[in-house]
C-alpha cells in the first residue's frame, strides 16, 4: 500500500496504490484511487512507467487521451471511466507480459488539487494445483500438476500425519516448458502414499504461492487447492 | 453519435492502388484507434490492421508491403493505401472503431467501399 | 495465427427456437472474442463483446459465453429479424482473425 501527497498551492489530494503482480497472458489491473471530485471534466488522470518516455495511458476533460500512448501500451489499456468520479483511477492492462513489470506511477489532478502515488508492478506465471492420485504407478503415488508458472518456482510436499518430514527423497519435479516459451507446466510425484492421511503440494515463487491439499481414505479423495499472492495489498 | 463514413473508388486495375479515407464523427481519433477489414465471398472477414491515437500503426503480416494507414486528427480524417491490387483484393473495405481502449470488439463500422479489381 | 472455426455453417430454426452457434480458437484467446451480426447488404454489428458483454442496444435474447478456446453465441428465442450471418473473432492477439460464419436461416 503507497499513499501519495500533493501540494497544488495549499491544496494536496490523496493518492493510493496497490502493489499487484499480474499473471503472463491474462488481465491485470493497477489500482490507484483518489479523493473524488464531482467534476469529471476538471479530472486528470495519468499513467506512467518507469524507464518508459511517453504515457501508460492518459484520461482528461472525461475522455481518454491516448496520443501520447507508448507503443507497447497501445490497444492494451483502459480506465474504469464510470468510476473516475468516485476516485477509482485504476487501469486495466489486455494479455499482460513479462515486460510490463516494473515501477508505475499514477498521477492525478483534480479540482480540489494533485498528488501521485507510485506502484510496484510484477509479472509472472502462477496457477492452482490439482493432485490426483496416481494409480497407474506401482506403488500408490500423488501427482500434482500446475499448468502455467513463471520464474521456475519450488516445489515441496508436507503431510498432516507426518509434520515436519523431508519428502524430497519420495518425490519427483519436472517443469515443462509450455509453447510460448515462457511459462512452464509444474508436474510433482510423491510416492509411496499412506491411506487416511493429508498431504499438501506447495508451489512458490517470487510472486505467488499456491496449495494443493488431498485427503485420502479407504472410502473417498477430497481435494482443495488455494493460490495467495506474495508482497501485495 | 458515433459515425464512421467512407469514401474511395469501386473499381481499380490491376497493379494499382487503393485509397480510401474514413471520416470519423462523435469521438475523437486521439482517444480511439481505427481498424481496417475487409470482407471478400472466398475469405470472409479479413482484419487488415489498425492506426492508433498515437499515430503508430499494426498491419496484418500478410499485407505488410502493400498497407499503408495515416491519419489528421484535426480532420478526424483517417486515410488507407494498398498497393498492387489483384483481382483476388476485390472485396468489401471497411473502417471501424474499437468498442473500448481495450480492443474487444469493434463497435462501429464504416458502410463499407465495394472495391473491384478488373481492367 | 490464430484459426476460429464456426460451426454450424448454417442452420435452419423456427421462431421461439433456442439457438446456439459455435466458435472454437486453435489457441486459447482468454475472453476476447466478439459475436457480430451481418444482415445482406450491411456492415456487420457487434452483438456481444469480452466473450459475454452485451453491447448498447442489444436486445437480450443473445448472450455470449465461453473463454480460452471455447465461445458460444445464444439466441434464447429466435425471431424473424435475426435471419443473417454471424461472426466470430478473436482481438486477443495479432493477426486479430475472424471465423468464417454461421448463416442462420428462418423456417
Known amino acids: 500500500l503507497i499513499i501519495g501527497f500533493g501540494i497544488s498551492g495549499k491544496h494536496f489530494i490523496t493518492v493510493t496504490t496497490f502493489t499487484s503482480a499480474g499473471n503472463i497472458g491474462e488481465d491485470g489491473t493497477l489500482s490507484c484511487t483518489f479523493e473524488p471530485d464531482i467534476k469529471l471534466n476538471g479530472i486528470v488522470i495519468q499513467w506512467l512507467k518507469e524507464g518508459i518516455k511517453g504515457l501508460v495511458h492518459e484520461f482528461k476533460e472525461g475522455k481518454d487521451d491516448l496520443s501520447q500512448q507508448h507503443e507497447m501500451f497501445r490497444g492494451r489499456t483502459a480506465v474504469f471511466a464510470d468510476q473516475v468520479v468516485v476516485g477509482n483511477a485504476s487501469l486495466r492492462l489486455k494479455n499482460v507480459q513479462l515486460t510490463d513489470a516494473g515501477t508505475y506511477t499514477c498521477y492525478i489532478r483534480t479540482s480540489k488539487g494533485k498528488g501521485n502515488a507510485n506502484l510496484e508492478y510484477k509479472t509472472g506465471a502462477f496457477s492452482m494445483p490439482e493432485i490426483n492420485v496416481d494409480y497407474n504407478a506401482s506403488s500408490e503415488s500423488l501427482r500434482c500438476e500446475a499448468p502455467r508458472w513463471f520464474p521456475q518456482p519450488t516445489v515441496a510436499w508436507a503431510s498432516q500425519v507426518d509434520q515436519g518430514a523431508n519428502f524430497s527423497e519420495v518425490s519427483n519435479t519436472s517443469f515443462e516448458l509450455n509453447s510460448e516459451n515462457v511459462t512452464m507446466k509444474v508436474v510433482s510425484v510423491l510416492y509411496n502414499v499412506t491411506i487416511n492421511n493429508t498431504y499438501s503440494c506447495m508451489i512458490e515463487n517470487d510472486i505467488a504461492k499456491a496449495t494443493g491439499d488431498i485427503k485420502v481414505t479407504d472410502s473417498e479423495v477430497k481435494r482443495r487447492s488455494q493460490l495467495q499472492l506474495l508482497n501485495s495489498g | 453519435q458515433i459515425q464512421l463514413q467512407q469514401s474511395g473508388p469501386g473499381l481499380v486495375q490491376p497493379s494499382q492502388s487503393l485509397s480510401i479515407t474514413c471520416t470519423v464523427s462523435?469521438?475523437?481519433?486521439?482517444?480511439?484507434?481505427v481498424q481496417w477489414i475487409r470482407q471478400s465471398p472466398g475469405k470472409g472477414l479479413e482484419w487488415l490492421g489498425v492506426?492508433?491515437?498515437?499515430?503508430?500503426?499494426d498491419y496484418n503480416a500478410a499485407f505488410l508491403s502493400r498497407l499503408s494507414f495515416s491519419k489528421d486528427n484535426s480532420k478526424s480524417q483517417v486515410f488507407f493505401q494498398m498497393n498492387s491490387l489483384q483481382a483476388d483484393d476485390s472485396a468489401i473495405y471497411y473502417c471501424?472503431?474499437?468498442?473500448?481502449?481495450?480492443?474487444?470488439?469493434?463497435?462501429?463500422w464504416g458502410q463499407g467501399t465495394l472495391v473491384t479489381v478488373s481492367a | 495465427n490464430i484459426v476460429m472455426t464456426q460451426s454450424p455453417k448454417s442452420m435452419s430454426m423456427s421462431v421461439g427456437e433456442r439457438v446456439t452457434l459455435s466458435c472454437k480458437a486453435s489457441?486459447?484467446?482468454?475472453?476476447?472474442v466478439s459475436w457480430y451480426q451481418q444482415k445482406p447488404e450491411q456492415s456487420p454489428k457487434l452483438l456481444i463483446y469480452?466473450?459475454?458483454n452485451r453491447y448498447t442496444g442489444v436486445p437480450d435474447r443473445f448472450t455470449g459465453s465461453g473463454s480460452a478456446t471455447d465461445f458460444t453465441l445464444t439466441i434464447s428465442s429466435v425471431q424473424v429479424e435475426d435471419l443473417a450471418d454471424y461472426h466470430c473473432?478473436?482481438?486477443?492477439?495479432?493477426?486479430?482473425?475472424f471465423g468464417s460464419g454461421t448463416k442462420l436461416e428462418i423456417k
Open positions: 471501424a472503431r474499437d468498442v473500448t481502449t481495450i480492443v474487444e470488439g469493434f463497435a462501429h
Open positions: 462523435g469521438f475523437s481519433l486521439t482517444s480511439y484507434g
Open positions: 492506426i492508433w491515437s498515437s499515430g503508430s500503426t
Open positions: 489457441e486459447k484467446v482468454g475472453t476476447y
Open positions: 469480452g466473450a459475454s
Open positions: 473473432g478473436q482481438t486477443y492477439s495479432y493477426p486479430f482473425t
